[in-house]
């Protein structure tokens, strides 16, 4: 899925791997490899619940979709799925609930036409940032990728690594600017706590964002104003406590614009008056009637859209010596 | 260092068979595909196809089917391309190389093989 | 099958020249492009591989470019040793196919 210029530095390093591993596929066209189903007429190779420690290297040249879900991979090195010739047709790559917990540099080059990858359900404790640019270069060739499936990829607590988890996934997502062509990426269920400011405005090509079953607070810092394309942004069941008069603004700047936020503990004081205005006289928000209040006690399960501005007040702050304890 | 170094000319007479031989050194031999290429006098290359030494499996041109038949010997590192049914289109000069996927590319070749069919 | 086509049969140049040559696939090969270097003697060298990748032991005065169906074959500065023939060849599909081959001679 790489041009040369995204190659060359990986795949240096990567040629061990690929001499004893890959070059050694046996070159018969149309075979199946043991343990998977292929469909010629489908252009389909399903490998899927037999605990395959490898991706098979005898894969059929003709293979468009291909699922690998329900294994054992453990690692993805670098060309994993690297043949020659290349698997030229290969669109969608679905590799969910695989047991991954680590994807190397290059893991998806050569892979000319992949539109569609799913690492969903593994714990990738280590994303490559060129996981899905194949190259340390600042600016890499297009990935072809259109849709990239990340939902639930977070390791447990135990397994992560000394980093930020948000931090590792969004390197991997702007390394090289590869992935400019992405219209749908899926990060749900992922415990995110922020989303990294410069994430996107890197993605100028996005269509569909779903965020939804994250641990998001706030979007102050985030900026939607040069997702032009955007047609569905998913926030349900996250911790978003108001949305700010800059994210109101920008949102309804979005000309295609759909967004979801049902389940937050949204908080019904002063500060939520002009997120109310907006949601009245918005169209953009989708089952806008069903938000509803979580704080403060005395506001729970009141609906957003009925409130008016005298419900919405702060309590005042005593200064220290009045304040009981 | 990588080398292939291929049989020698052959002169044989139509309707008969002839194997040209394509020995590898300086690299694993079974970690390689190898493959086979045709040159007519004056003209441009033809992929005939493939094998991999490791596993035997083989691939090949629709062109050369039933025409070229390919095998591998891992014991003494060497490749073979038996050409049958010969006529004067297989006069041509035959190159095995070595094919590999860091590369994508046939990187090294052999110096080539003459066979000329004729009676 | 994909066509290979080099629509420059042969071509004249001086020593020290900056020579172009070119290939045109029949259908996208997405950087699956290889060129080689047939001398007199019938001799086969990789020169360039997956469009730009320098091939150890080639000059650097050898570079190569491209993308989606066009691709060209640099020689910066034209020396004796690069009389020869060239030949393109796509690595994307079987059967692998070659451009009819430049052969390349000094003015």
């Known amino acids: 899925s790489s041009s040369p210029t995204s190659s060359a530095s990986s795949f240096s390093s990567s040629a061990p791997f690929l001499a004893s591993a890959v070059s050694a596929q046996p070159p018969l066209p149309d075979q199946c490899p043991a343990l998977c189903e292929c469909s010629e007429a489908a252009r389909t190779v399903k490998c899927v619940n037999r605990n395959l420690t490898e991706v098979p290297t005898d894969l059929p040249a003709y293979v468009r979709n291909l699922f690998l879900t329900g294994n054992q991979l453990a690692v993805l090195p670098a060309g994993a799925f690297a043949r020659r010739p290349p698997l030229a047709e290969l669109a969608a790559l679905n590799l969910s609930g695989s047991r991954l917990d680590e994807v190397r540099a290059g893991a998806f080059e050569h892979l000319p036409s992949l539109r569609q990858l799913d690492l969903s359900h593994n714990p990738l404790a280590d994303l490559s940032p060129f996981a899905f640019s194949g190259s340390n270069a600042s600016v890499s060739a297009p990935s072809p990728l259109v849709e990239l499936i990340l939902n639930h990829i977070v390791p447990p607590e135990d397994e992560r690594q000394n980093r930020s988890f948000e931090g590792m996934v969004v390197a991997a997502l702007l390394a090289g600017r590869a992935l400019q062509g992405l219209r749908r990426l899926e990060l749900a269920s992922n415990h995110f706590l922020y989303l990294p400011r410069d994430v996107l405005a890197q993605l100028p090509s996005l269509r569909h964002l779903d965020l939804s079953n994250n641990s998001l607070v706030s979007l102050t810092y985030v900026s939607f104003r040069n997702l032009t394309h955007l047609e569905s942004l998913h926030l349900e069941d996250n911790a978003l406590k108001v949305l700010h008069n800059g994210t109101l603004a920008e949102l309804q700047g979005l000309p295609h614009i759909r967004v979801f936020l049902d389940n937050n503990p949204w908080v019904c004081d002063c500060h939520m008056a002009d997120m109310v205005t907006w949601l009245k006289e918005t169209e953009v928000v989708q089952g806008k009637d069903r938000l509803t209040c979580a704080y403060p006690e005395k506001m729970r399960n009141r609906v957003l859209l009925e409130l008016n501005s005298a419900d919405l007040d702060c309590d005042p702050i005593l200064p220290p010596s009045l304040q009981t304890s | 260092q990588v080398h292939l170094q291929q049989s020698g000319a052959e002169l044989v007479r139509p309707g008969t068979s002839v194997k040209v031989s394509c020995k590898a050194s300086?690299?694993?031999?079974?970690?390689?595909?190898i493959e086979w290429v045709k040159q007519r006098p004056g003209q441009g290359l033809e992929w005939i196809g493939v094998?991999?030494?490791?596993?035997?499996?083989?691939n090949y041109n629709e062109n050369f089917k039933g025409k070229a038949t390919l095998t591998a010997d891992k014991s003494s590192s060497t490749a073979y391309m038996q050409l049958s049914s010969l006529t004067s289109e297989d006069s041509a000069v035959y190159f095995c190389?070595?094919?590999?996927?860091?590369?994508?590319?046939?990187?090294?070749w052999g110096q080539g093989t003459s066979v000329t069919v004729s009676s | 099958d994909i066509q290979m086509t080099q629509t420059t049969s042969s071509l004249s140049a001086s020593l020290g020249d900056r020579v172009t040559i070119s290939c045109r696939a029949s259908?996208?090969?997405?950087?699956?492009l290889n060129w080689y270097q047939q001398k007199p003697d019938g001799t086969v060298k990789l020169l360039i591989s997956?469009?730009?990748r320098l091939h150890s032991g080639v000059p650097s005065r050898f570079s190569g470019s491209g993308s989606g169906t066009d691709y060209s074959l640099t020689i910066s500065n034209l020396e004796q040793e690069d009389i020869a023939t060239y030949f393109c060849?796509?690595?994307?599909?079987?059967?692998?196919?070659f451009g009819g081959g430049t052969e390349l001679e000094i003015k």
């Open positions: 094998i991999n030494p490791g596993s035997g499996g083989t």
């Open positions: 060849q796509q690595d994307i599909k079987h059967p692998y196919t």
């Open positions: 259908q996208d090969i997405s950087y699956y």
């Open positions: 190389a070595r094919g590999t996927v860091e590369l994508y590319a046939m990187d090294y």
């Open positions: 997956y469009t730009s």
């Open positions: 300086g690299y694993a031999f079974t970690n390689y595909v």
